[in-house]
């Protein structure tokens, strides 16, 4: 139960106080007592309910007839059952009794109010009052959790404006309420008692620029909606009538959590005595609603596909061809960013990141931003940010950043348990170096911080700075799979490559072609290259980064080997001995449910079958998935990239809901 | 082949900043390897910076690092050398030099390692 | 002080050769087969005439020639021509923490 005041009687005047229904009020009868008195007893009206304890051990009664010693061990507490209809109404009588004396009396008149501040704090997606019965200042993690919760009102609800809705203090129309949370001030008082009394709303300075909240006039419209609190307003004093009133407010938040905020906001109704207009208004009263705004959350490959995106670049027509027959099998949407655009930017993993933050009462797609800041640098504000579909950024957005910044670094894993650990939501993956060097690259801080900050998808570290992109999307992949864990890890494997070239070899096809059929690229006999001593060395160095990467994956996502499956891939190493992949990138593939998109590899044809599609297609078929091979030789490869580069997708969000888990 | 023609250098002050344009003609420079060299009055080449084709790596030689900034605009043909922080030392001659990365071996030559063209190059003269 | 040590000057009369050495460290020349070589004449840019130890771009005469043995590389330039006269500089990739190394640079005179 809440605590309300402490208040002191006194033998001399009646003392008037006011009891806001739901708390506990400690009642001081011993500090004025008359001083030959050894005892009391206390009456109250019907509405009141005394508490009498004295301790230790506690014996508690409730107030009768009963008379009890006077020292400093006996506690005296009030609570209201029903608010007043006029001030005063309710009345406690103390006598104070001595051996020698008659009884001396001491009144106390009582106006019970009902003030409640009421928030989703049971994560229903309805406000249900509470009766201050639960700790609204608390937010807890869990299925038995509680705490309200925010979203960030990042997406943009008015076409005509450039701005996420949260950058304005506006409240478009019910489409932009909807995006806040509801939060509720019940009052139920006297007539005349806000002629005495003020209520204010407040938030922590430290927290006022993080949120911002409107007052809703019931019955009207939502344009009537005015901001009372936000960030250059800390507190605001509220107009309530005297009488049984309910007041709306929506409340949005202006800021994800980071490193320097932890995304718990907090907004107090404080109960202020104004009657004495010759001193300070004093505080009786207050409660508070502790929401956490939503974090960011990524989708896993193994989340069902709703959009897929592509860029429209000089004679890649064949390839988006592919892409939008994979989407229709997919059932997807597809969306194509034209040349004008794109301004010959084709890399549409690396610009952004589609995730989704979600309340009770509304989920909403989000794209995060990177800060790479290339040819793509316009799409996601001007066309992927919009009506239900937020934007969030990080990172310098000039200068700063390395190759490790694009967001062909950054996956995440399909939900995992890890030595009994869950993590329903998966974990974060991104590419950093092994260790810090005067050129090693890394993930820029504020997006890791950020990352880490969302809480609940723990991020992992791998190492990808061997690679000349950097990309952990450049070795690694995850599918559906309908047994074990329900999702396979792909990993690029030269040491599968190799034992399947020379399986080759030794069938007699030591002469067929990588690269047949490709005009103006040298192509290379099966033999050749198994004797190539160099590329051998080359991939020997290779094998040992994506091993360490595949304990570090095994340890960190509680992966054993049969959960992992090696896709043939050479890779060859250019200047500074960084890795780049010698034929197109298989594991580099678009993943749309049971649909893959991989880049097709031109391997030796055997038999009038490419001996590595077959191979791939011998892992990958029997899980239920249905591999196409997209060419994407010219248009993608050979600029340093692959089908996965090229293509971003908005999945399914999370049936589970993030509030359910303990971080 | 590429032709390569360096701008933007010039007096300034110690402490202050330039950036360095090179800017490429005859061939797309998103297929080349790119480096700064330098060559104070009178003295010999000192290799400045490096970027790759792809724009997702770069080096730098330990008089510049933390000072000099080397990027690219694939889109504008042209690769940029911010220098800030300046000292009267860095007073050279500024050569913009490439290398080609569409290389066809099984194993690509360390064409990142020398330059195989390079531009007329422009005076950065730091003094007070 | 350079990385890479190249001799001052070397002087040749015309149809003669010469050899100008560049001698690194187990970290750069000695490690990589990444030497190259390169000419500049007075108020000119340098110009690549070896790469890879011993391999010539396009357009440079078979007179050039690069070699390599341990810590040293070599570049011998046969039947001295008038043009020959320049300034040649080798350069390595290092594991050090500047990866590119040039030398101090070599004055070639024809007599």
């Known amino acids: 139960m809440a605590q309300g005041t402490l208040i002191r009687v006194t033998p001399e005047q009646p003392t008037h106080a006011v009891c806001v229904l739901g708390t506990l009020t400690q009642l001081d009868i011993c500090s004025s007592a008359p001083e030959d008195c050894t005892s009391f007893s206390i009456n109250a009206s019907p509405g009141v309910v005394v508490d009498i304890a004295h301790g230790p051990p506690a014996k508690k009664k409730s107030t009768g007839s009963s008379t009890w010693p006077l020292d400093p061990g006996v506690e005296v507490t009030l609570t209201m059952k029903v608010a007043s209809g006029s001030t005063g109404d309710q009345k406690v009588q103390i006598s104070y009794y001595g051996p020698k004396t008659p009884p001396v009396k001491a009144l106390l008149y009582l106006t019970g109010v009902e003030i409640s501040l009421c928030a989703d704090i049971t994560r229903t997606g309805k406000v249900k009052p509470t009766r201050a019965v639960k700790d609204q200042r608390t937010w807890t993690w869990g299925p038995c959790g509680q705490g309200a919760i925010l979203l960030v009102n990042c997406d943009r609800d008015n076409l005509e404006s450039s701005a996420m809705d949260c950058e304005d203090d506006e409240v478009l129309d019910s489409e932009d309420l909807q995006d806040m949370s509801l939060m509720t001030l019940s009052t139920k008082t006297p007539k005349d008692f806000f002629t005495n009394h003020t209520l204010v709303l407040h938030v922590a300075r430290s927290e006022m620029d993080k949120v911002r909240v409107f007052q809703a006039t019931r019955g009207k419209l939502s344009s009537k909606c005015s901001v009372v609190l936000g960030p250059k307003w800390p507190s605001h004093y509220l107009m309530v009538p005297g009488g049984k009133h309910n007041m709306d407010f929506y409340v949005e938040a202006l800021a994800f959590p980071d490193t320097d905020f932890p995304g718990l906001i907090t907004l107090t109704i404080s109960l202020l005595d104004t009657s004495n207009l010759e001193l300070p208004e004093a505080v009786v009263f207050q409660d508070s609603v502790v929401f956490r705004v939503a974090p960011w959350i990524m989708t896993p490959n193994t989340q069902p596909p709703q959009e897929v995106y592509a860029c429209s670049i000089f004679e890649n027509e064949d390839f988006l061809k592919s892409v939008t027959t994979l989407a229709m099998k997919a059932k997807c949407k597809l969306t194509i960013c034209p040349e004008e655009e794109n301004m010959d930017d084709q890399w549409m993993q690396d610009e952004m990141e589609i995730g989704y933050i979600q309340a009770p009462h509304k989920t909403l797609p989000v794209v995060f931003d990177s800060p790479r800041n290339r040819g793509l640098k316009e799409f996601p504000i001007k066309r992927v940010m919009g009506p239900d579909f937020g934007y969030v950024t990080r990172g310098p957005q000039t200068g700063g950043i390395s190759g490790l910044d694009s967001f062909g670094n950054l996956e995440v894993s399909p939900p995992v348990t890890v030595r009994g650990k869950e993590y329903p939501l998966g974990r974060i993956l991104f590419g950093d170096s092994c260790y810090p060097s005067n050129d090693s690259r890394q993930m820029h801080q504020a997006l890791q911080d950020f990352l880490s900050a969302q809480q609940v998808q723990a991020p992992v570290k791998l190492y990808s700075d061997w690679l000349s992109v950097g990309h952990v999307d450049e070795f690694l992949s995850f599918v559906p799979a309908p047994d074990r864990k329900g999702f396979r890890l792909l990993l690029a494997s030269p040491r599968s490559c190799y034992k399947l070239f020379q399986e080759q070899q030794n069938e007699g096809h030591g002469e067929a072609l990588l690269f047949e059929g490709i005009k103006k690229k040298k192509q290379q006999k099966i033999k050749n290259i198994l004797s190539n001593k160099t590329l051998r060395e080359h991939n020997s160095f290779v094998e040992r980064c994506i091993d360490w990467n595949r304990e570090l994956l095994k340890r960190e996502l509680g992966l054993a080997e049969s959960d992992i499956i090696d896709i043939p891939q050479l890779f060859k190493l250019k200047e500074f001995s960084k890795a780049e992949a010698f034929f197109p990138n298989m594991v580099n593939m678009l993943v749309l449910g049971k649909h893959l998109g991989i880049p097709k590899p031109f391997g030796p044809v055997i038999n009038g079958r490419c001996c590595l599609e077959e191979k791939v297609c011998s892992l990958l078929e029997p899980l239920g998935l249905q591999c196409t091979f997209i060419n994407d030789f010219f248009t993608y490869h050979i600029r340093h990239g692959e089908v996965h580069c090229g293509t971003n997708v908005r999945r399914k969000p999370f049936s589970f809901k993030w509030w359910n888990m303990v971080p | 082949q590429v032709q390569l023609v360096e701008s933007g250098g010039g007096l300034v002050k110690p402490g202050g900043s330039l950036r360095l344009s090179c800017a490429a003609s005859?061939?797309?420079?998103?297929?080349?390897?790119v480096s700064w060299i330098r060559q104070a009055p009178g003295k010999g080449l000192e290799w400045v910076s490096f970027?790759?084709?792809?724009?997702?790596?770069?080096y730098y030689a330990d008089s510049v690092r933390g000072r000099f900034t080397i990027s690219r605009d694939n889109a504008k043909n042209s690769v940029y050398l911010q220098m800030n922080s300046l000292r009267a030392e860095d007073t050279a001659v500024y050569y913009c030099s490439s290398a080609n990365d569409d290389v066809d071996d099984i194993v690509a030559p360390g064409r990142g390692y020398y330059m195989d063209v390079w531009g007329r190059g422009t005076l950065v003269t730091v003094s007070s | 002080q350079s990385a890479l040590t190249q001799p001052r000057s070397v002087s040749g009369s015309p149809g003669q050769s010469v050899t100008i050495s560049c001698t690194g460290t187990?970290?750069?020349?000695?490690?990589?087969?990444?030497v190259s070589w390169y000419q500049q004449h007075p108020g000119k840019a340098p110009k690549l005439i070896i790469y890879?130890?011993?391999e010539r771009p396009s357009g440079v005469p078979d007179r050039f020639s690069g070699s390599k043995s341990g810590n040293t590389a070599s570049l011998t330039i046969s039947g001295l021509q008038a043009e020959d006269e320049a300034d040649y500089y080798c350069?390595?990739?290092?594991?050090?923490?500047?990866?590119?190394?040039f030398g101090g640079g070599t004055k070639l005179t024809v007599l």
């Open positions: 970027i790759n084709s792809a724009n997702t790596f770069t």
């Open positions: 187990s970290g750069d020349v000695g490690r990589y087969n990444h």
């Open positions: 005859g061939s797309t420079l998103s297929d080349y390897f």
């Open positions: 350069s390595s990739h290092s594991r050090s923490s500047t990866p590119v190394l």
């Open positions: 890879n130890v011993y």
